[in-house]
């Protein structure tokens, strides 16, 4: 006569986090008398999941009516699965006694939990950098299972290749984290650019998660300055403009110097925005030539985003007639203001 067998038909079961896991177990006989118990893991440290005889197991329900006469199905359902529930589950028949003794165990069912990765978080450098510099971006996502995951980097839709990725821990774990660092070379046109970290995982059903960083938070485009002398507005008056072009971010302070002495300081306010996201600004100075005996050196000095000042000068010759004086080129950006110098 055949002895009782404990049958666990599923070698493995995979369940999404939050769902219920059904672990199947049947026995071939009601002999001997004694309870079925479910354990996670084997050996002395195994964890009791369900005991037919006694105990309170709020997350566990029996699939069939365990008190029903002739019941040989001891499958269980575990609700609200989390990655911590992963492991091998054994259905074990015990023989009634004091204490009950283990009679026979099933072969085990490995429960793997599919947990979605968290939304990728992309972070850039702490300080801004200028074009032609290489900056690093990091992307992190946590809590996923199984371990297999794909991470890609994009800049404005173009896939990047210069990055390094680690998935931790290296060994078995209930859930995993991914950390990736990408290197990006900045260009002057990157104010509107985006860096995207894309994570693909079996739990996402082909719809990857994305984290983004705007390069506008990272880039600093220094201005170019151009100081020019405009045609005469009135007799003995010269209009000198300082064009501040292609700068980002907007934070900018301009100072006019006359022969090295501060004449006026102003902050960029009514700027114009270029298509590439940079700004232009212009400031002008109305100089009364008749008030000067000697030549005047006019300097447009710009401090951009807390960086060391850059400047451009223009020599205004008092001896010559204003109409005959040329202009001197310098650097860029917008705004407008006027001042008479007497």
């Amino acid at each position: 006569e055949e002895e009782l067998q404990v049958i666990q038909p599923d070698k493995s079961v995979s369940v999404a986090a939050g769902e219920s896991a059904i672990l199947h177990c049947t026995v071939t006989s009601l002999i001997p008398v004694g309870p079925i118990q479910w354990f996670r893991g084997a050996g002395p440290a195994r964890e009791l999941i369900y005991n037919q005889k006694e105990g309170h197991f709020p997350r566990v329900t029996t699939v069939s009516e365990s008190t029903k006469r002739e019941n040989m199905d001891f499958s269980i359902s575990i609700s609200n699965i989390t990655p911590a529930d992963a492991g091998t589950y054994y259905c074990v028949k015990f023989r009634k006694g004091s204490p009950d003794t283990e009679f026979k165990s099933g072969a085990g069912t490995e429960l793997s939990v599919r947990a979605k990765p968290s939304a990728p978080v992309v972070s850039g450098p702490a300080a801004r950098a200028t074009p032609q510099h290489t900056v690093s971006f990091t992307c992190e996502s946590h809590g996923f299972s199984p371990r297999d995951i794909t991470l890609k980097w994009f800049k404005n839709g173009n896939e990047l290749s210069d990055f390094q990725t680690n998935v931790d821990p290296v060994g078995e774990s209930v859930s995993y984290s991914i950390h990736s660092t990408a290197k990006v070379v900045l260009t002057r046109e990157d104010v509107h650019s985006q860096v995207i970290c894309e994570v693909a995982h079996v739990t996402l059903q082909g719809d990857p998660l994305r984290g983004t960083a705007n390069l506008s938070e990272t880039i600093r485009v220094p201005p170019t300055l151009e100081v020019t002398q405009q045609p005469v507005r009135a007799e003995n008056q010269v209009n000198v403009t300082c064009q501040v072009r292609k700068f980002y971010p907007q934070r900018l302070q301009l100072t006019w110097l006359e022969n090295g002495n501060v004449s006026r300081t102003e902050t960029a306010s009514t700027v114009t925005e270029n298509k590439d996201g940079t700004y232009n600004w212009m400031s002008w100075l109305l100089v009364n030539v008749s008030a000067h005996r000697d030549d005047v050196k006019l300097t447009c000095q710009v401090e951009h985003d807390g960086q060391p000042a850059v400047s451009k000068s223009h020599d205004l010759k008092v001896s010559a007639h204003p109409k005959e004086q040329g202009s001197n080129t310098a650097a860029e950006n917008t705004g407008s203001n006027e001042r008479n110098i007497y």
Partner: antibody, heavy 115, light 111 residues
Framework: RQLVESGGGLVQPGGSLRLSCTAS????????ISWVRQAPGKGLEYIGT?????ITYFASWAKGRFTGSKTSSTAYMELSSLRSEDTAVYFC????????????WGQGTLVTVSS | AIQMTQSPSSLSASVGDRVTITCQAS????????LAWYQQKPGKAPKLLIY???TLATGVPSRFSGSGSGTDFTLTISSLQPEDFATYYC???????????FGGGTKVEIK
Amino acid sequence: RQLVESGGGLVQPGGSLRLSCTASGFSLSSHGISWVRQAPGKGLEYIGTIGTGVITYFASWAKGRFTGSKTSSTAYMELSSLRSEDTAVYFCARGSAWNDPFDPWGQGTLVTVSS
Amino acid sequence: AIQMTQSPSSLSASVGDRVTITCQASQSVYGNNDLAWYQQKPGKAPKLLIYLASTLATGVPSRFSGSGSGTDFTLTISSLQPEDFATYYCLGGGDDEADNVFGGGTKVEIK
């Protein structure tokens, strides 16, 4: 689905008897067969349960004198060293108790131990 | 070994009465619920009514119910019917396989 006992009768003190319990309509292979007796005018008394070869057990008072065996359709109980106080109706029932209670029962077979 | 004490040993009741029979174990039964109730009529084999202390056996009328845990158990017939006049036995199981003991029985007679 029923159980039918046979093998009862008159036996002398010290004698032996083999009772049979035959199932019809179901198999005994996945169930234990338990034996219960009832002396005339008395209550029920559990004797033991026959499962597989290894899993056969008897109440302490019946150990040594009573033994059992089983096939997929018939269970047997050997009664030896019989005494007058063993006179009773002997019932077999499918089940081993706890979550496998005794049900159904056979109609019973009378064993009389007398000289 | 476990011992089962059933009370009363007999009782008289009328049709429609509510009848309660108790069974007390000398120690906690196995799993706190290894207690079954059987009905026996004269010259017949016993019939299973309740097992696992409170589970109604298939085909048994719902007027029969079982309750209790550990050492104290009750069989209740909510409204006695003419066919319910019989002797009732509890069967308790101790911690060992062969430790199954019947109570002394309760004879329910017509008043």
